[in-house]
């Protein structure tokens, strides 16, 4: 809980508490906004982002967005609140410990996005289907 000597503030989202009043630590994420990238046709890539930031709000998770068009490839790394859409998409995988890229429909470009909730998890972005636990073959391997 916030101890008695720490003020409680009204309507503040910098702090998240559970029903017992415990305080949530914020996420640590790669946060370089949009950078040009050489990541292409690989199973996974490192972000090459040297900035690990403390997310402003404890409910925020790590996000990575990979975009390719006729001119360039970019990789965006940020913190974002999973209750809010990002680039008009819901962060459906926000509880995942790994950043597993999912393709999204965007006209005129190839667009992949992932979100995750372990420290610096958007540093390693994964495109390979073998990491996707919705894959029944992978589940078979895991439980063998």
């Amino acid at each position: 809980t916030i101890p008695p000597h720490v003020q409680k503030s009204v309507n503040n989202d910098m702090i998240v508490t559970d029903n017992n009043g415990a305080v949530k630590f914020p996420q640590l994420c790669k946060f370089c906004d949009v950078r040009f990238s050489t990541c292409d046709n690989q199973k996974s890539c490192m972000s090459n982002c040297s900035i690990t930031s403390i997310c402003e709000k404890p409910q925020e998770v790590c996000v990575a967005v990979w975009r390719k068009n006729d001119e360039n490839i970019t990789l965006e790394t940020v913190c974002h609140d999973p209750k809010l859409p990002y680039h008009d998409f819901i962060l459906e995988d926000a509880a995942s410990p790994k950043c597993i890229m999912k393709e999204k429909k965007k006209p005129g470009e190839t667009f992949f996005m992932c979100s995750c909730s372990s420290d610096e998890c958007n540093d390693n972005i994964i495109f390979s289907e073998e990491y996707n636990t919705s894959n029944p073959d992978l589940l078979l391997v895991i439980f063998q």
């Epitope: 008695p4 630590f25 640590l28």
Partner: nanobody, 124 residues
């Protein structure tokens, strides 16, 4: 008994510097990620900076990146925050807090995770 005791706060002019200290006792300092957290008057907690127990990897909020430097001296069980280029919006009570590896939540205890805080006022 776990204790975290902050010091070094005070009144400073905009553009000035301060160095905060947090003396830790009653737990194995080298097992914990340590944080500086601040609370401006009437506002909520803002997580300012963190440092790993070993290897001294550091993390900062974007609002203080490039101006503040966190460090620790494990031999003295002490955490530091060097604050440069201070601004009026840095005015707050500064607390140190501790985090076990993998810990997502702070349990509800006044003394286990928080110090009493030290007030930093940036004003001309």
């Amino acid at each position: 008994e776990v204790q975290l005791l902050e010091s070094g706060g005070g009144l400073v002019q905009p553009g000035g510097s301060l160095r905060l200290s947090c003396a830790a006792s009653g737990f194995t300092f080298t097992e914990y990620r340590m944080w500086w957290v601040r609370q401006a008057p009437g506002k909520g907690l803002e997580w300012v900076s963190a440092i790993e127990p070993i290897g001294n990897r550091t993390y900062y909020a974007r609002s203080v990146f490039g101006r503040f430097t966190i460090s620790r001296d494990n031999s003295k069980n002490t955490l530091y925050l060097q604050m440069n280029s201070l601004r009026a919006e840095d005015t707050a009570v500064y607390y140190c807090a501790k985090q076990m590896p993998g810990q997502k939540w702070m349990a509800k205890s006044r003394f286990d995770y928080w110090g009493q805080g030290t007030l930093v006022t940036v004003s001309s």
